[in-house]
């Protein structure tokens, strides 16, 4: 069925109650238009945002009958003349007749008559009307005609994008059959379709038809108010294609339109090849839309690539939200023109600050205030980083101006980054020369501190991105950011305890959950000794805090659960609620404080692994007291595991091995190598996972799995030698496509996704070295086997 | 064809104003704007400001903003530009010219020479 | 004093090309268009490129325009007599919201 089938079986639907063969029409408040209701129409009770009346009429081809409910006798059928007054076009009835026209319509044949309604008659411009009446014999006839066509054609049969010759020279009638039920002709609506003639069809349209002869070109050409827009289709090289075949619809800006443009804004897109072609593009879309089609906002993708909104308010026709249509349907052979009051400018036409909304004025304006403004060359590429209005706080905006531009300078990187650009790890260099880390999670991007918010977009020289506060780069380690807040001084020393001081000290990628002081409320010295005396419990229980990858609370989906690991080994679970940040359905007092090395919650209840038991009653006693949110298991004589250290030193090393590179499946005890050609340079850095150092190749642009496994014996292979950024570069360019470890008589299991991709962030190189014990030595680094 | 003519010369005494015509032929006046170029004798060109024949906005040179005047009449389509307060140094040819934004300045009027001296 | 720079003078014979150069700064024809206008003698100026490049109607082919940065030339190939004039370059300011010409480059044929 065609949709203009469908929409009459919808509204046959909702008029069954009023009796047989009922259709349910609605009627715009205040104006004569109807339209069969669709499903949508129906429920909103509107058209294009007008409310409407529901009228109850009989579907077509049906009438009435005295004393019976609905519309139980079928329509008389005659010929088409006669069926022009059955549907009540009576005017055109009645020029068929004075034209000559009726005896053709009469006899025999097969036409289908686009007949206009009485009103679209009155409607019509009374000069040409009267120059019509005044020559029937040719003028009036050729127009009647110009409305047929030699064959029977139905609503069905009238596809979209068709053109068919009508009975005068054959001059094309341009069909449109759209998804809401809306079928036009030369943007005519069809009111009333497919009434059945006993020689033809007769569809009942809203306008009279007039003739087309010209393209959209010729129409710019002979138009003076039009100039402006002609003048940029010239100089954009666009004038010719809207003389091409096509189905175009045009949204052609008048001269007024061009004025109200501010000069400067106008003169650099005119002086710009790409931007003054984005610009003309944009108002081109490739598919005819009348604007009797329109009933409500649809979205279309414009020549130019990016996408117009397209609605309508009563009988005016808006174009991304604002009313702006002032001559609507001007048909041509190639298209359809609709004259618009303002010219729509493309984001990829625009300046990058001009990019911003009226969410980011404060920035924008800040900007400009602080001389950043002018550094953003037009021919430069550039991304903004837009904090939200209500990220300024009236400190910030008093602050210092010095201060402030530093701060403003954290927020305009040196290059052009798109959405999609973006990835886990990836460092972004600032104007003011700092470096900021983006995390990308499940449902959400973030620079440093400062989360995305939806309303990216790409201009000419640059791109923006919306961030819901202002960003602040990192100054201090893990290990320095504590050190400087008395709150942790007792988790700092059991830490410094069990040797885990350099962890938190040298580059890396970590969550941190850490306890205040009040989660030790109560402990003893006594009782801190014990602790401290168990090495291997403390460490358990400080690594338990820990995490690899750096997981911003503002990055979690609201209100669900995620399941990272931590280097203790157990599982940790966290949740975003009301602003929140849930870690093992405790909330965290303070989240998201950033460091070079990582990110900090703040928790003020020490927390434990609920799967390792506790073999000592001393112990328990202790951790009891400490810990109320979960029941610690007890098992007599159950010792915690030791896990083996790391020391992290930031170095690269540079290799040079000749040989094709060797994957293999690596069993315990066996020795990996891996051999690679020519002169990479690798970026490695070590992860504890399930207490065992993986050491991994740093690939930022894929997802990486491991499967945890036994301990394994590696062969290191090293060389001397400095390294440049271009060879690292060359390097880092060769793909690794899976990092993987072998389980014997494993489950070999892998992580959840969202949990391998934090498990590969990371940049420092490390050895293995027996737990407790540093070593000073040359610098080493190891490779793991990989399966590709 | 598209013409421009402008009124006659003008001396005018320091301090006085002068307001100097430009009838528009050949064109639809009302989709079209006008700005004023003047040149002072021997000297280059000089942008003074801009006004639409459509809606009546202008935008002046902030040189002479305040001394400036421009206006149009759609039913003779023709545009007035006034100068006030004239100084010896405004003496110059002052022309009009139609301008469309898109393209600037394609069809100039003849000048108007305007003498400023005591 | 003209916001744009342009060279004094430039000369040349019947049939050589001759290019007019127009120097400027970020401001005008590092971020707009640049125009360029002739004036013969005892004339009212006349449209020869618009945006950059663009030749109107009616202007021949030996006339065209190029921008590069900040600056911008108009090239005058196969020299004619009828072309000793004028030539001034333009382009929109945008610190000072005012068109700007240059200075005018006066073109003589030899």
């Known amino acids: 069925n065609s949709y203009y089938d469908k929409v009459l079986a919808h509204s046959r639907i909702r008029g069954r109650d009023q009796g047989p063969n009922v259709c349910a029409l609605q009627q715009i408040l205040g104006t004569k238009k109807k339209y069969f209701s669709s499903c949508k129409n129906w429920y909103q009770g509107a058209i294009c945002g007008k409310k409407t009346t529901v009228l109850y009429e009989c579907c077509p081809g049906y009438m009435r009958m005295e004393g019976m409910k609905g519309c139980p006798a079928v329509m008389p059928i005659d010929h088409v003349y006669g069926t022009l007054g059955i549907v009540g076009a009576t005017t055109t009835q009645h020029y068929s007749d004075v034209s000559k026209l009726r005896e053709e319509i009469e006899g025999k044949g097969s036409y289908t008559y686009f007949a206009p309604s009485n009103e679209a008659w009155e409607n019509l411009d009374s000069d040409i009307r009267r120059g019509l009446e005044n020559n029937v014999n040719v003028e009036l006839l050729n127009a009647l005609h110009s409305h047929m066509v030699n064959k029977r054609m139905l609503t069905k049969d009238l596809k979209h994008g068709m053109v068919i010759p009508s009975m005068y020279n054959n001059l094309g009638l341009f069909i449109n059959h759209y998804p809401n039920g809306v079928v036009t002709v030369n943007c005519a609506r069809v009111i009333h379709g497919n009434q059945i003639a006993t020689n033809g069809v007769v569809h009942v349209i809203d306008r009279v038809l007039t003739q087309i002869g010209t393209s959209i070109q010729d129409f710019l050409e002979a138009e003076d108010d039009l100039s402006s827009f002609r003048a940029a289709a010239i100089t954009s090289d666009l004038l010719e294609s809207l003389g091409r075949d096509g189905h175009f619809t045009l949204f052609a800006p008048t001269n007024e339109a061009f004025e109200k443009l501010p000069r400067g804004v106008l003169e650099r897109i005119m002086g710009d090849k790409v931007a003054s072609e984005a610009l003309m593009k944009y108002h081109i879309l490739n598919t005819l839309q009348c604007s009797e089609a329109i009933t409500g906002g649809a979205v279309f993708e414009t020549m130019e690539g990016n996408t117009i909104e397209i609605g309508c308010e009563g009988d005016s026709i808006s174009i991304n939200g604002i009313k702006m249509v002032n001559k609507k349907d001007i048909v041509t052979k190639n298209g359809v023109i609709h004259l618009i009051d303002e010219v729509l400018i493309p984001d990829s036409a625009k300046q990058v600050i001009e990019l911003a909304g009226k969410q980011q004025t404060t920035f924008t304006d800040l900007v400009a205030q602080l001389g950043l403004a002018s550094s953003l060359k037009p021919d430069g590429e550039y991304t903004l980083l837009a904090p939200v209005n209500n990220a300024f706080s009236d400190d910030t905006l008093s602050m210092d101006q010095r201060l402030l531009k530093l701060i403003l300078q954290n927020h305009i990187l040196k290059v052009k980054v798109g959405l999609s650009d973006l990835y886990n790890g990836q460092i972004l260099e600032t104007i003011g020369g700092k470096q900021l880390r983006v995390f990308v999670y499940r449902t959400a991007i973030c620079i440093e501190n400062s989360c995305m918010v939806r309303g990216s977009k790409q201009g000419r020289n640059g791109a923006i991105h919306i961030f819901r506060e202002i960003i602040q780069p990192a100054e201090k380690s893990l290990h320095d950011k504590l050190r400087q807040d008395k709150r942790f001084s007792i988790f700092l020393s059991l830490l410094e305890a069990a040797d885990l001081k350099d962890l938190l000290t040298q580059p890396g990628d970590w969550t941190l959950f850490a306890p205040t002081n009040d989660a030790f409320k109560g402990m003893t010295s006594e009782e801190r000794e014990l602790l401290i005396g168990d090495k291997n419990a403390l460490q358990n229980i400080i690594l338990y805090h820990l995490t690899p990858g750096v997981y911003i609370g503002k990055g979690f989906e609201p209100g669900v659960t995620n399941i990272l690991k931590t280097t203790q080994g157990s599982k940790i679970y966290l949740k975003g609620v009301n602003e929140t940040l849930l870690v093992n359905e405790l909330k965290s007092k303070e989240s998201d404080i950033m460091t070079t090395n990582g990110v900090i919650h703040v928790v003020d209840k020490l927390l434990y692994p609920a799967d390792i038991p506790v073999g000592n009653d001393q112990l328990l006693e202790l951790l009891n007291k400490l810990i109320k949110y979960i029941q610690i298991k007890f098992v007599r004589g159950s010792t915690f595991k030791e896990i083996p250290m790391t020391v992290y030193r930031p170095a690269m090393t540079k290799i040079q091995i000749e040989g094709d590179p060797d994957f293999r499946l690596i069993k315990e005890g066996e020795t990996v190598t891996e051999v690679i050609h020519g002169e990479p340079v690798i970026k490695k850095y070590t992860k504890i996972i399930d207490g065992v150092p993986v050491e991994i190749t740093e690939k930022q642009t894929r997802e990486e799995r491991i499967i945890t496994g036994p301990e394994i014996k590696y062969t290191r292979i090293s060389t001397g030698g400095g390294e440049t950024g271009e060879t690292l570069q060359k390097f880092l360019q060769k793909e690794v496509s899976k990092v993987t470890k072998f389980i014997e008589g494993g489950d070999g299991h892998l992580f959840e996704d969202e949990e391998i991709k934090r498990l590969l962030q990371g940049d420092t190189p490390a050895k293995k070295i027996p737990a407790n014990k540093r070593v000073q030595g040359p610098r080493r680094r190891s490779r793991e086997g990989r399966s590709q | 064809q598209v013409q421009l003519v402008q009124s006659g010369a003008e001396v005018k005494k320091p301090g006085a104003s002068v307001k100097v015509s430009c009838k528009a032929s050949?064109?639809?006046?009302?989709?079209?704007?006008i700005s004023w170029v003047r040149q002072a004798p021997g000297q280059g060109l000089e942008w003074m400001g801009w006004?639409?024949?459509?809606?009546?906005?202008?935008n002046y040179a902030q040189k002479l903003q305040g001394r400036v005047t421009m206006t149009t009449d759609t039913s003779t389509s023709t545009a007035y530009m006034e100068l006030r307060s004239l100084r010896s140094d405004d003496t110059a040819v002052y022309y009009c010219?139609?301008?469309?934004?898109?393209?600037?300045?394609?069809?100039w009027g003849q000048g108007t020479l305007v003498t400023v001296s005591s | 004093q003209s916001v744009l720079t342009q060279s004094s003078s430039a000369s040349g014979t019947p049939g050589q090309t001759v290019t007019v150069s127009c120097s400027g700064s970020?401001?005008?024809?590092?971020?707009?268009?640049v125009n360029w206008y002739q004036q013969l003698p005892g004339t009212a100026p006349k449209l020869l490129i618009y945006?950059?490049?663009q030749r109107p109607s009616g202007v021949p082919d030996r006339f065209s325009g190029s921008k590069s940065g900040t600056s911008a030339s108009l090239a005058i190939s196969g020299l004619q007599s009828a072309d000793e004039a004028d030539y001034y370059c333009?382009?929109?300011?945008?610190?000072?919201?005012?068109?700007?010409f240059g200075s005018g480059t006066k073109v003589t044929v030899l």
């Open positions: 333009a382009a929109w300011d945008d610190s000072l919201s005012t068109y700007v």
């Open positions: 006004i639409s024949a459509y809606s009546g906005n202008t």
């Open positions: 970020s401001s005008d024809i590092g971020s707009n268009r």
């Open positions: 010219a139609r301008d469309i934004l898109v393209v600037p300045f394609d069809y």
């Open positions: 945006s950059n490049d």
């Open positions: 050949g064109y639809t006046f009302t989709s079209y704007g």
